[in-house]
């Protein structure tokens, strides 16, 4: 499982997330959806996938997950 | 293997309706969000519409907006575009995509669209 | 609407050139920008995810930058499969939206 890339929150997205339990805040359309399907992902021991492009940190980055965390692929979902 | 198979293209007349269909296999279509993407001839590529895993949103570009309803069947893996009072411009190849996110912490971030169909062709036209 | 503007729009180079094609966007997008490489009658491709980040399987002499309203695809030696149309496209916010292309041709 691949990490993310880098967080890239520059939007104006609430930090912490004003979503309640369950759901997620989906960035693009700026608003809570229903995330039950998600699960945590189980971290891939470091440089086991590539490099997170290096894009410059956002204001909001250092709440919720930061760049060390490892991020959960979702092809499509939501 | 991932892929998305495109079907119910074809011509049509200006007023009248067409559905398109695709069918999804090799990924957890229920768990997938999914767009309408659309080229006119010779022309830039046009988001269309997006739909969640579970239907509960759907988004709409503003030149379909009222004509078109995207929709999903994920007992059948596959993906509908309902396409309505159909014009002259809405002539192009249509194109299904899975939508590209990643979950950090509680935030869904979207990078794109990872799986294209083949594209079916719609023609309107008298 | 974010609007996206590709330049050049179309381009002439040589199998071993380094290629860049150049995406303007209307308004600050952080780095929510993609590229895709689109061949005659087939769909396009996802290259480039988040400005820079290889799509999987993607070959490594394609690489992305950028971040606000300036972004920049770059193939640092052009190989004969990589004739083709390049697009970028915006996931900031709906509508999402696509460059016009960049068309790479050989010289």
């Known amino acids: 499982m691949r990490r993310g890339p880098r967080s890239l929150r520059g939007r104006d997205a609430p930090a912490p997330t004003p979503c309640v339990p369950a759901e997620c805040f989906d960035l693009l359309v700026r608003h809570c959806v229903a995330c039950g399907l998600l699960r945590t992902p189980r971290p891939k021991p470091a440089g086991a996938s590539s490099p997170a492009p290096r894009t410059a940190l956002q204001p909001q980055e250092s709440v919720g997950a930061g760049a060390g965390e490892a991020a959960l692929p979702l092809p499509g979902l939501l | 293997e991932v892929q998305l198979v495109q079907s119910g293209g074809g011509v049509v007349q200006p007023g009248r309706s067409l559905r398109l269909s695709c069918a999804a296999s090799?990924?957890?279509?229920?768990?997938?969000?999914m767009h309408w993407v659309r080229q006119a001839p010779g022309k830039c590529l046009e988001w269309v519409a997006v739909?969640?895993?579970?239907?509960?949103?759907?988004y709409y570009g503003d030149s379909v907006k009222g004509r078109f309803t995207i929709s999903r069947d994920n007992s059948k893996n596959t993906l509908y575009l309902q396409m309505n009072s159909l014009r002259d411009e809405d002539t192009a190849v249509y194109y299904c995509?899975?939508?590209?996110?990643?979950?950090?912490?509680?935030?869904?971030?979207?990078?794109?669209?990872?799986?294209w169909g083949q594209g079916t062709t719609v023609t309107v036209s008298s | 609407e974010i609007v996206l503007t590709q330049s050049p729009s179309s381009l002439s180079a040589s199998v071993g050139d380094r290629v860049t094609i150049t995406c303007r966007a209307s308004?600050?997008?952080?780095?929510?920008l993609n590229w895709y490489q689109q061949k005659p009658g087939k769909a396009p491709k996802l290259l480039i995810y988040?400005?820079?980040s290889l799509q999987s399987g993607v070959p490594s002499r394609f690489s992305g930058s950028g971040s606000g309203t300036d972004f920049t695809l770059t193939i640092s030696s052009l190989q004969p499969e990589d004739f083709a149309t390049y697009y970028c496209?915006?996931?900031?916010?709906?509508?999402?939206?696509f460059g016009c292309g960049t068309k790479v041709e050989i010289k």
């Open positions: 995509a899975r939508r590209f996110t990643y979950l950090r912490g509680w935030y869904i971030e979207d990078y794109g669209l990872d799986v």
């Open positions: 090799g990924f957890t279509f229920s768990s997938s969000g």
């Open positions: 739909i969640w895993y579970d239907a509960s949103n759907k």
């Open positions: 308004q600050s997008i952080s780095s929510y």
């Open positions: 988040a400005a820079s």
């Open positions: 496209q915006q996931s900031y916010s709906t509508p999402l939206t």
